[in-house]
Interface confidence: low
């Protein structure tokens, strides 16, 4: 009889075990386990009748179509086999065990005790057949296995082969290389690859296979497994396969489709092709004179572009427009998009005018083109060039005049200070004095009401500043409330500055009338004590410097006592009369402590920002109307005049033991330079 066993494990015993089995007996056990398992059979006890080639009693182990083992006897001999420690493994999930005894047993045989169990099949190790094994990776689990693919591959629906997604490859460049996936390694199986070359209309694609060409083939049937097809419009070229690459293909089209098909088997290395766009040829190009074209090629085809540029110092000129470069393109009809432009020498054009300066051309015909040279110089003797710059400018390749130090910036002509054209021949006085010679005090400024009435003096600093006394720029304060308010200040539009003035009221051709832009009183000015009695007036425009108008120099250091200074102005003379012309006096600087002692009885403080000058016996002094005017001294080594002070205050005019007090410019020089930016 037959016993069907479906468990994952079990025990099989000879009939009557452990007693002796009966004669003339046959039992078959059919063991079936799930797919993915095999059956392992082993015996714990085996005792059957011995016979030659197990003719009498036996245990036969088999599958559907194969005998795995036949056992009998008690121990293995030349002609019979017992299982002993041997394990019988079924190749599949089925095993059949048949026990048979013949009609007689000469002895008592106890039979067998066998055990079986389902054991997992490791398909990954055991599958040799390419048609069944995993293409890339195999993963075993109890009862089965599965396949997976390398990065970039997709598992085919057969759950075994690995394909690639390659149906969306677009090529738009004019040249390129296309290969089978993974080239030169074997191409993937079960794949449908599509490569599209899509170029601009006017191009024609040429294909050429290179290097290795290895696509699975068949000796009789043309390309039944793997192949390449090339589709150009309605026309299909191919299929191509084997080891011989197709000849170069001229498609005569700007749009080409390449199809590559692979089946689920084979290990071929694939293919590689290069493509190139061809177009109409354009005529040869000649670079312009003083220029070049890039790239320089023997031949130019559709879509080739060339850049026309010029040598250093030249500019591309196209339709009267100057540019750095000009691009032209080979069109599909074989003509160039534009004519080659010309190269025109860079022109820096007329150089910028230099305030208070002149331009001289170093190159012939006053050329202003590339590498031409000009020289700026200042209007001497009234202006000099800042930092002693050479003033030489060259026309650069960029079309701008360039100086080695200043670059494209123009030089600066600074006013020359303290060097009058006319030198003094005699000394004169203001209070108790004689007229000054015309042009010997070119820095003096007259502060005048708009009706022409002068009210103070001042000195020209740099090209657009007047230094004067702070008390000149406000109304007299109420003794009951001596606070300086904005409303007390003179508005810039309320007065004017006259430079080059000699006569007090009469005009002459040397005068320059200038408006006021802004006034700045010293931040520490005290109208009650006259401390820091200094102010700066910014002119709306710079005066023209000449023999009668020139700035004074700021002091280089402190003033020595006893030094002779000159004070100038249009202030009152004896008998409260005003002079007709500018007057001046020459007086000595007085020791500071002497001056302090002189004013102590009057309870007037002479502070460190003040400097005194005059003679002990009096007589020579500044007076009303001279306020703000210059007190200067001559540096004999340099022949240059320097500002020492500005007329400020005093007890009456020219009194014995009552010196003139001046705002000390050296003390406030830093403030003056900070506000005006003036340097000597």
């Amino acid at each position: 009889h037959t016993v069907e066993l479906n468990n994952m494990f079990g025990q099989i015993q000879s009939p009557g075990y452990p007693d002796s089995y009966p004669s003339d007996s046959e039992v078959t056990w059919n063991i079936t386990v799930p797919d993915g398992f095999r059956i392992k059979l082993y015996f714990m006890h085996f005792n059957l009748e011995s016979s030659y080639l197990c003719e009498y009693d036996y245990v036969k182990v088999e599958t559907e179509d194969q005998v795995l083992a036949t056992f009998c006897g008690r121990e293995t001999t030349d002609t019979e086999q017992t299982p002993g420690q041997e394990v019988v493994l079924s190749p599949g999930s089925f095993m059949s065990i048949t026990f048979r005894s013949d009609f007689s047993n000469e002895e008592r045989f106890t039979g067998f005790d066998a055990h079986y169990m389902a054991v997992d099949v490791d398909e990954c190790k055991e599958r040799e057949d390419e048609e069944l094994s995993c293409d890339h990776y195999c993963h075993n689990y109890i009862g089965g296995y599965y396949c997976s693919c390398r990065f970039g591959y997709i598992l085919h629906t057969d759950n075994r082969t690995c394909r690639v997604e390659c149906s969306d490859n677009l090529f738009t460049q004019r040249t390129g290389v296309i290969t089978s996936p993974d080239f030169p390694n074997p191409y993937p199986k079960s794949s449908e690859c599509l490569y599209t070359i899509e170029l601009e209309e006017g191009f024609m694609v040429n294909l050429q296979f290179e290097d290795i060409f290895d696509i699975e083939d068949h000796p009789e049937v043309p390309c039944p497994y793997d192949y390449i097809k090339i589709k150009v419009g309605p026309k299909v070229l191919g299929p191509f396969c084997g080891e011989k690459a197709p000849e170069p293909i001229s498609t005569q089209s700007h749009s080409v489709l390449i199809l590559f098909h692979s089946d689920n088997s084979g290990e071929n290395r694939g293919w590689r092709l290069s493509y190139r766009a061809a177009g109409n040829e354009c005529p040869e190009l000649q670079p312009p004179v003083h220029g070049k074209i890039e790239p320089s090629q023997a031949k130019y085809f559709f879509k080739d572009q060339v850049l026309v540029s010029c040598d250093t110092g030249y500019k591309v000129l196209k339709d009267n427009v100057e540019m750095d470069t000009f691009q032209i393109e080979c069109l599909k009809d074989g003509t160039w998009s534009n004519k080659i432009p010309t190269c025109k020498i860079v022109d820096c054009r007329a150089p910028g005018e230099l305030e208070h300066g002149l331009i001289t051309f170093s190159t012939r015909n006053n050329l202003t083109t590339y590498k031409s040279e000009i020289k700026y110089s200042c209007q001497e003797p009234y202006y000099k060039m800042l930092n002693n710059n050479t003033g030489i400018y060259t026309c650069s390749a960029q079309g701008v005049w360039m100086n080695k130090v200043l670059g494209r910036s123009l030089p600066t002509c600074l006013p020359v200070c303290g060097l009058p054209k006319f030198s003094r021949k005699l000394m004169a006085r203001i209070f108790n004095g004689r007229p000054a010679q015309k042009g010997t005090t070119p820095w003096i400024a007259m502060l005048s009401h708009l009706n022409g009435q002068p009210f103070c003096g001042g000195s020209l600093l740099g090209s657009s500043w007047i230094v004067t006394a702070a008390h000149c720029l406000h109304q007299s304060l109420d003794p009951e409330d001596p606070t300086l308010r904005d409303s007390d200040l003179l508005s810039p539009s309320d007065f004017k500055i006259i430079l080059g003035k000699h006569w007090r009221l009469r005009s002459d051709e040397n005068e320059q009338h200038l408006g006021v832009k802004h006034t700045t009183l010293h931040p520490q000015y005290d109208p009650n004590t006259f401390e820091n009695d200094v102010a700066l007036v910014e002119l709306l425009e710079s005066p023209v410097l000449n023999a009668f108008v020139m700035p004074i120099c700021l002091p280089e250091g402190p003033q020595q006592e006893g030094a002779m200074v000159i004070v100038s102005g249009w202030g009152k003379q004896f008998l409260q009369r005003f002079p007709e012309t500018l007057m001046e006096i020459e007086i000595p600087i007085v020791d500071h402590s002497t001056c302090q002692k002189a004013y102590a009885p009057l309870k007037k403080k002479v502070t460190r920002d003040m400097i005194c000058a005059g003679e002990k016996e009096g007589g020579k002094d500044a007076c009303a109307g001279d306020s703000g005017g210059p007190m200067v001294t001559l540096n004999r080594e340099r022949g240059q005049w320097y500002l020492v002070g500005t007329v400020s205050w005093g007890d009456d005019c020219g009194k014995k033991d009552r010196y003139g007090v001046y705002s000390y410019i050296h003390h406030n020089k830093d403030w003056i330079q900070r506000v005006t930016g003036v340097r000597n």
């Epitope: 009338h513 200038l514 408006g515 709306l540 710079s542 005066p543």
Partner: antibody, heavy 143, light 102 residues
Amino acid sequence: AVTLDESGGGLQTPGGALSLVCKASGFTFSSNAMGWVRQAPGKGLEWVAGIDDDGSGTRYAPAVKGRATISRDNGQSTLRLQLNNLRAEDTGTYYCAKTCEPGTTFKDKCNTCRCGSDGKSAFCTRKLCYQAWGHGTEVIVSS
Amino acid sequence: ALTQPSSVSANPGGTVKITCSGDSSYYGWYQQKAPGSAPVTVIYDNTNRPSNIPSRFSGSKSGSTATLTITGVRADDNAVYYCASTDSSSTAFGAGTTLTVL
């Protein structure tokens, strides 16, 4: 009082020539730079020409350069504007104008005039200002 | 060239600003109440006001743009306002801005 009287306007033919005269009084004519300003019908003001106090420096607007001549006679206190090759666009009111202060000059680009606070109307700019204006003379260029 | 708006409007007592852009350093503002009438300067040198002009008129300049500001606008401020500038060789006027007091 400052007065400026223009004359010489009227109907002119295209291509012809025009001579405007301005007679000045009430100020020292020889100390003032002078100028001409015009206003086309329904349009804004347009500076035409200017001259130094001594007549040595002249300047012209691009629209009239090469066709206009400004001159003065300090002895007679008169200012002239000669305009040749007349065009339709020269039509308008032409004003004679006096500068704000004596000594204003075109010769030096840095010189400046300033306007006084004398209550008179004044037009000031960085390089040139007109303080007094004539009533204008109308010029029509038409065929 | 000087660029200014062609027209602006303001309510009586309000404030109005007129701008003028060019490439000059100094600008003037000039009022003409009717074509053919004598011009009147309201501002010169960007910020200065002649003494006969009320303080309601003020000028300012930022970069290359000048601005005329009229505060407390009155009906008799109705006029065309021209900005002007002069370089070393010529004088230029803007096209004018018509101020309408509503």
